[in-house]
Interface confidence: low
């Protein structure tokens, strides 16, 4: 069974001091066999017993092993069902605690009832505050039965449930008609899936005979031991104030386990700790009684004395539950109640015995679950005991179960059963996961799902260059941490595999499947500098940069240019794939936009440091192009241009710009402003005779717009050489915009 205990502090004078604590003694609590398992959950279950809403309860975690619920403000907060859930996967287990109000009209004589399939269960509700109304019994919140108020027997209302079956399990309540549900007596009925002393799928297996009030689990045949007892059959008492499957937990506070209710996995239910009884677990056991709820009687013989926590304490020369066995009868000493080994190992098991006559090697034997008897290969004889050592053949899964050490002498015989768990070493089902990579290191998550048994004690990571025949390098890591493989070669593929181990000899599992992880190439370290930039249009920008001069080859594959448009929150990235490039033309930008620009060297997927940024403002986009531009020669020095205004203008045109260029000429074009935007014609003067010219024009609003189509026209012949073209109107005031 899962080692899970729900503790309720029943010192109820002040609800604010009330708390519930759930404690897990599981190895690696919070760890499932697939990776990290689910945490402990502790909550109030309002499905059956609903209480008025109050302030939320406070949950405090103490590591993965303990969780505490506090913050109860009034007594009614306490009434109802609380549950703790722990364990992982198929072992996930719910422990339930039912709390009754001490001031209720009806109180349960006993809250938890564990019965066997087919038994008759009797729930008894004691009258605490009498009302002369009927009593309603409910099962899991639904109406079940009614008793007339005068059917009380000796101040109690009894509900008899004959021939109970597992579906009858649940929360039962007895409530006076028309009384508050908080005044009910709440019970918990647990019906084992088998008859008394049996367990297993068809109830064909025999329970081990649980001692000291332990309850045989109907699924796995294990004893769920009362708080304060341990061992395969609950045969050993813990020291006072201790609980848990291995007595590993300690009751809080100076008065030990007084005032605490302990709830354990079904089919045990809840009880006081060992040595205590009463509805609030505050009364010590009466003389001659011991154990949880003081349900056990000592009946010590041969001068034994009764200890309320552990039972009979025998005088020298006697042993046994009731001190009924003479020390002359042989006795198995200090045999562990449970042993764990790994599959296919060949462990040595020791069994020590004392007695008179003294046990010898041949008088001690070991019996496996299949009935095979092993004889000891060696015995160590000491004055007070003989220890026989058994060499166990290679273990198989079928060896899991109850083994028995038996000693026989002429003085009698003794035997001790103990449980052997054969565990399967874990084997990874998946390859490790690459988290990050650099040029000389890989960061790997080694924790993968696995077959076989946990807990994982060590994780080995094996790695070597891909397709290499060299020996594997191995690193042993903590199961819960990511691993950094150091001192690797850059730009190299590595085969990486996980090997998991569980505790104990032979706990190493087979290697898991490999995965290929490739180191990055060296990080580029040079920082470029933006040398200059100029606008080549409303949406085009030419950028140039330089790199510091350093000796040796350039480490880099190219450059990344980044333009950040802060207004729109957009980033544009331009990849320049040559490490030799020092200039780039960026096109398709948004006119009228303020950009932040920087450049970085890259190598593989790694980026070097960015250049200091530049801030560039692109001019706003202008209007569309003028339409139907036409040129007509007027003389040997004049050509008239006519056009139509652009369509769909975003605003009033401020001017037109005319570009004039000699056809086939190598010189720069001349730009002439037409400052009267309402005009649709102009005469260009001062041209050379018999010369062919090219004309195009564009409009301007806030920025220059698109160029029109280009037109050609020749001046007429026989003119003189002119000084240069000018526009007809206000020609003297016009400058040529180069």
């Amino acid at each position: 069974a899962v080692d899970l205990t729900l503790l309720a502090n029943l010192r109820l004078t002040d609800p604010q001091r009330f708390f519930l604590t759930c404690v897990s003694g599981e190895a690696g609590a919070g760890r499932g066999s697939d990776a990290w398992g689910p945490p402990l959950l502790l909550e109030k279950d309002d499905r059956i017993v609903r209480t008025p809403p109050g302030p939320p309860l406070r949950l405090a975690r103490n590591g993965s092993h303990q969780v505490t619920l506090r913050g109860f403000s009034k007594p009614s907060d306490l009434v109802g069902v609380f549950s703790c859930v722990g364990g992982a996967g198929a072992r996930r287990t719910r422990v339930i605690y039912v709390h009754n109000s001490p001031g209720a009209h009806l109180l349960p004589d006993k809250v938890t009832h564990t019965v066997n399939k087919g038994d008759t269960a009797v729930l008894s509700a004691r009258v605490h505050k009498e009302k002369q109304t009927d009593v309603i019994w409910k099962s899991n919140g639904s109406y079940f039965y009614t008793l007339d108020w005068h059917e009380a027997q000796d101040g109690r209302f009894l509900l008899q449930l004959p021939n109970v079956q597992p579906p009858s399990s649940g929360i039962y309540s007895a409530t006076y008609l028309e009384a508050s549900p908080l005044g009910s007596a709440f019970f918990r009925l647990i019906v084992r899936g088998c008859g008394a002393g049996r367990w297993g799928p068809g109830c064909t297996k025999e329970c081990p005979g649980c001692l000291h009030g332990g309850v045989c689990h109907d699924h796995d045949g294990e004893c769920v031991c009362p708080p304060g007892f341990t061992g395969t059959r609950c045969e050993q008492a813990c020291r006072e104030g201790r609980f848990g499957q291995s007595c590993q937990e300690q009751c809080p506070g100076i008065s030990g386990c007084r005032g605490l209710t302990f709830c354990l996995p079904d089919p045990y239910g809840c009880s006081c700790g060992s040595g205590w009884r009463g509805s609030q677990c505050q009364e010590a056991c009466a003389p001659g009684h011991f154990g949880a709820d003081c349900r056990l009687q000592c009946q010590c013989q041969n001068g034994g004395t009764c200890d309320r926590f552990s039972g009979c304490v025998c005088p020298s020369g006697w042993h046994g539950v009731h001190c009924e066995k003479s020390d002359r009868i042989p006795q198995i000493l200090n045999m562990a109640s449970e042993l764990e080994f790994n599959l296919e190992t060949m462990p040595r098991i020791n069994c020590a015995a004392a007695g008179n006559p003294f046990p010898v090697r041949g008088s001690i034997e070991l019996r496996k679950p299949d009935g095979t008897v092993l004889l000891s290969t060696k015995a160590i004889v000491e004055p007070e005991k003989t220890t026989a050592e058994f060499e166990v053949p290679r273990l198989v899964l079928a060896d899991s179960g109850f083994w028995e050490c038996r000693v026989s002498t002429s003085g009698g015989q003794d035997s001790r059963r103990f449980k052997v768990n054969v565990k399967v070493p874990p084997v990874p089902l998946a390859a490790p996961r690459l988290l990050t990579k650099q040029s000389r290191q890989l960061v790997v998550s080694p924790l993968v799902s696995f077959s076989g048994d946990g807990p994982i004690s060590t994780v080995r990571l094996h790695y070597r260059p891909q397709d290499s025949t060299m020996d594997w390098s191995t690193i042993v890591v903590d199961p819960s941490e990511n691993v950094t493989l150091m001192n690797l070669r850059p730009k190299t593929g590595y085969s990486v595999r996980v090997q998991l181990s569980r505790p104990g000899e032979g706990g190493e599992g087979a290697w898991g499947p490999p995965t290929l992880m490739t180191t990055d190439c060296p990080e580029p370290l040079l920082q470029p500098w933006l040398e200059g930039w100029h606008v080549e249009g409303t949406d085009r920008l030419r950028v140039s940069w330089s790199l510091p001069l350093v000796p040796g080859p350039l480490v880099g594959d190219g450059f990344l240019l980044r333009l950040w448009d802060g207004t729109r929150g957009q980033e544009r990235r331009e990849n320049v794939s040559s490490p030799q490039a020092r200039t780039a033309l960026l096109t398709g930008l948004t006119p009228g936009t303020h950009y932040q620009l920087d450049v970085q060297l890259y190598h593989c997927t790694l980026l070097g440091p960015a250049s200091p940024p530049a801030h560039v403002l692109l001019p706003p986009s202008g209007p569309p192009a003028p339409r139907h531009l036409h040129a007509q020669a007027l003389s040997d020095s004049e050509i008239q241009l006519t056009w139509k205004h652009p369509e769909a203008l975003p605003g009033p045109i401020s001017k037109y710009v005319v570009e004039v260029q000699v056809a086939g000429g190598a010189g720069d074009p001349l730009w002439i402003d037409v400052d009267r935007p309402e005009e649709t014609s102009t005469i260009i003067r001062g041209l050379n005779a018999s010369t062919r010219y090219l004309f195009r024009m564009r409009a301007s609003i806030q920025g220059l717009g698109d160029w029109s189509n280009t037109v050609e026209e020749s001046t007429l012949g026989n003119g003189l050489q002119a000084e240069g073209p000018v526009q007809e109107s206000r020609a003297a005031e016009e400058g040529l915009d180069q």
């Epitope: 992982a88 996967g89 399967v424 089902l429 696995f450 087979a510 995965t515 290929l516």
Partner: antibody
Framework: EVQLLESGGGLVQPGGSLRLSCAAS????????MVWVRQAPGKGLEWVSV????????GYADSVKGRFTISRDNSKNTLYLQVNSLRAEDTAVYYC?????????????WGQGTLVTVSS | DIQMTQSPSSLSASVGDRVTITCRAS??????LAWYQQKPGKVPKLLIY???TLQSGVPSRFSGSGSGTDFTLTISSLQPEDVATYYC?????????FGQGTRLEIK
């Protein structure tokens, strides 16, 4: 003797659902990963899904991701495949197989398969 | 996902011939490759695992070789009962993809 027995196949309309089961016996079911593989009529084998021994980890082929769900009940030694939003191209024989547990990477144990036909 | 490509798609050979089927992975998979034989109406049968290890009970005329990206299944002397479709499957990373299959017939 290891045995895997699939069931739950049949004729279903496009967009419909089925739940395929695979009952396992003859080995400790809770110690092995399990997989589903399918084979369309006259076509090759297609790997569909995997689940780890405890059921805590699953994986799917891209072609079924979001529509199929693999699960298992170790107490019943049974593997399941819930198939939703079925399409004509999901018509196939669905096999369950036992995943390997160590160095021997290969599927040695297969079920006999169950046929799923998606047609209107 | 890793793609597995088998060649040829089908082949016809005579009894006693040496037959070779190849399988290529789209990226390195070490030696994590299995070969299966499937006869009409039957379930696949594991022949070879980890590229070259013969599954117990499989006739020794079957052998496998290769690692990384290129793998070969060889039948040293073809027998009538070897008529089947043969598949490769990678186990290096999920999904554990299969090749498209090679149909083998007797001439």
């Amino acid at each position: 003797e290891v045995q895997l027995l699939e069931s739950g196949g049949g004729l279903v309309q496009p967009g419909g659902s089925l739940r395929l089961s695979c009952a396992a016996s003859g080995f400790t079911f809770s110690m092995y990963g399990m997989v589903w593989v399918r084979q369309a009529p006259g076509k090759g084998l297609e790997w569909v899904s995997v689940i780890s021994p405890s059921g805590g980890n699953t994986g799917y082929a891209d072609s079924v991701k979001g529509r199929f769900t693999i699960s298992r009940d170790n107490s019943k030694n049974t593997l399941y495949l819930q198939v939703n939003s079925l399409r004509a191209e999901d018509t196939a024989v669905y096999y369950c197989a036992r995943a390997p547990r160590g160095y021997s990477y290969g599927y040695y144990y297969w079920g006999q398969g169950t046929l799923v036909t998606v047609s209107s | 996902d890793i793609q597995m490509t088998q060649s040829p798609s089908s082949l016809s050979a005579s009894v006693g011939d040496r037959v070779t089927i190849t399988c290529r992975a789209s990226q390195g998979i070490g030696h994590y490759l299995a070969w299966y034989q499937q006869k009409p109406g039957k379930v696949p049968k594991l022949l070879i695992y980890t590229a070259s290890t013969l599954q117990s009970g499989v006739p020794s005329r079957f052998s496998g070789s290769g690692s990384g990206t290129d793998f070969t299944l060889t039948i040293s002397s073809l027998q009538p009962e070897d008529v089947a479709t043969y598949y490769c499957q990678q186990f290096n990373s999920y999904p554990h993809t299969f090749g498209q299959g090679t149909r083998l017939e007797i001439k």
